[in-house]
């Protein structure tokens, strides 16, 4: 048969952050090419990344159609010069991916502190509401639009002059915290989805400190 030197893909892995979703697999092809198909549990298979020598395929456009659906992908292997060729059972070799539910499993990207503003003994810290590739009515939704109150942010803050940290939570993108007048503070935030069992927390944002560009001070 024409598939004697064709090997099935393996280690199929979903890599997804803020719904940007790529399927990766092995091995690097030698005299073979790959095509990927994706479907929901009840839907039809859709082919992507036709006859590619890559070992990854960006499936974002498919999964953002409904991020709460559960998806399955499969990777077909074909001989490089003869993509019409099939395996011994009359089917090309393929391997299934694990199931993937974007809403429950996409990693939360590192958040960014957009700004902070001090008014007297209060500081308003605002977290950037990152745009995703999820669309509704032809507009891209933000992370908050997609997750709503399921997404919270944890703020860590501390006086620049000491190591003792404090924390606060919000299910919006804003914190209003009490500070000591005349003290400079540093801030870092983390995104969390409490209801999840996997990929629950993001990495911490870069630290931002008062007395630097992002801040504003009003008496």
């Amino acid at each position: 048969s024409g598939t004697t030197n064709t090997v099935a893909a393996y280690n199929l892995t979903w890599k997804s952050t803020n719904f940007k979703t790529i399927l990766e697999w092995e091995p690097k092809p030698v005299n073979q090419v790959y095509t990927v198909q994706i479907s929901t549990k009840s839907g039809d298979w859709k082919s992507k990344c036709f006859y590619t020598t890559d070992t990854e395929c960006d499936l974002t456009d498919e999964i953002v159609k409904d991020v709460k659906q559960t998806y399955l992908a499969r990777v077909f292997s074909y001989p490089a010069g003869n993509v019409e060729s099939t395996g011994s059972a009359g089917e090309p070799l393929y391997e299934n991916s694990p199931e993937f539910t974007p809403y429950l499993e996409t990693n939360l990207g590192q958040p960014t502190i957009q700004s902070f503003e001090q008014v007297g003994t209060k500081v308003n810290v605002t977290v950037e509401d990152e745009r995703t590739l999820v669309r509704r009515n032809n507009t891209f939704l933000s992370l908050r639009d997609v997750f709503g109150k399921d997404l919270i942010y944890t703020l860590y803050y501390w006086k620049s002059s000491s190591s003792g940290k404090k924390t606060a939570k919000t299910n919006t993108n804003e914190f209003l915290i009490d500070v000591d007048k005349g003290e400079n503070y540093c801030f870092s935030v983390q995104a969390v989805i409490p209801s999840r069992t996997v990929n629950r927390k993001s990495t911490d944002s870069p630290v931002e400190c008062m007395g630097q560009e992002k801040g504003e001070f009003r008496e």
Epitope: T154, K165, A168, K169, N171, I177, P194
Partner: antibody, heavy 117, light 107 residues
Framework: EVQLVESGGGLVQPGGSLRLSCAAS????????MHWVRQAPGKGLEWVGW????????IYDPKFQDRFTISADTSKNTAYLQMNSLRAEDTAVYYC??????????WGQGTLVTVSS | DIQMTQSPSSLSASVGDRVTITCKAS??????LSWYQQKPGKAPKLLIY???SLADGVPSRFSGSGSGTDFTLTISSLQPEDFATYYC?????????FGQGTKVEIK
Amino acid sequence: EVQLVESGGGLVQPGGSLRLSCAASGFNIKDYYMHWVRQAPGKGLEWVGWIDPENGNTIYDPKFQDRFTISADTSKNTAYLQMNSLRAEDTAVYYCARDTAAYFDYWGQGTLVTVSS
Amino acid sequence: DIQMTQSPSSLSASVGDRVTITCKASRDIKSYLSWYQQKPGKAPKLLIYYATSLADGVPSRFSGSGSGTDFTLTISSLQPEDFATYYCLQHGESPFTFGQGTKVEIK
């Protein structure tokens, strides 16, 4: 099955030190926040502090900041409470608890620390 | 720091009674409040989170209400297994603080 098991409690003299352990099973501690809460005999619950085991961030009630240190070893799936300069008023049952960021859903059975000469 | 004032500190009630326990925060904590039940010699058990959401496996006779500074735990019809001490916890900002507890005793 999710389980938290505290150990390391016992009798210690005033001024002494003790390290409590909270061994977790059934989940990965780095995916959650881990807290220590204590309860003096016949009294209410008192929050001690938390750790995010993934990045080592710790938060304490200021009254414990100078004497207590929370740490975690993700390879052992265990959180720790190091207590120094212990006083009679630190006598309590010490609990560890898992925090989803919305609530403390699992608690250990507690370990009794008695500070007495 | 946020103070949580819980009342009453104790109450006597009979099986079937409706019981209400309140917690007042010294400032706005939005809905970052949970309620726990503790029996002697045991660890606390989660009842209510986000002020109003019933935790998994908790009987529907327990309910929570409130947001901002005023919160209530209600047991609609007290059962024998409900005699215990109840605590509120604010976790909106550190230091997290518990209420002083309410001991529900048999009348």
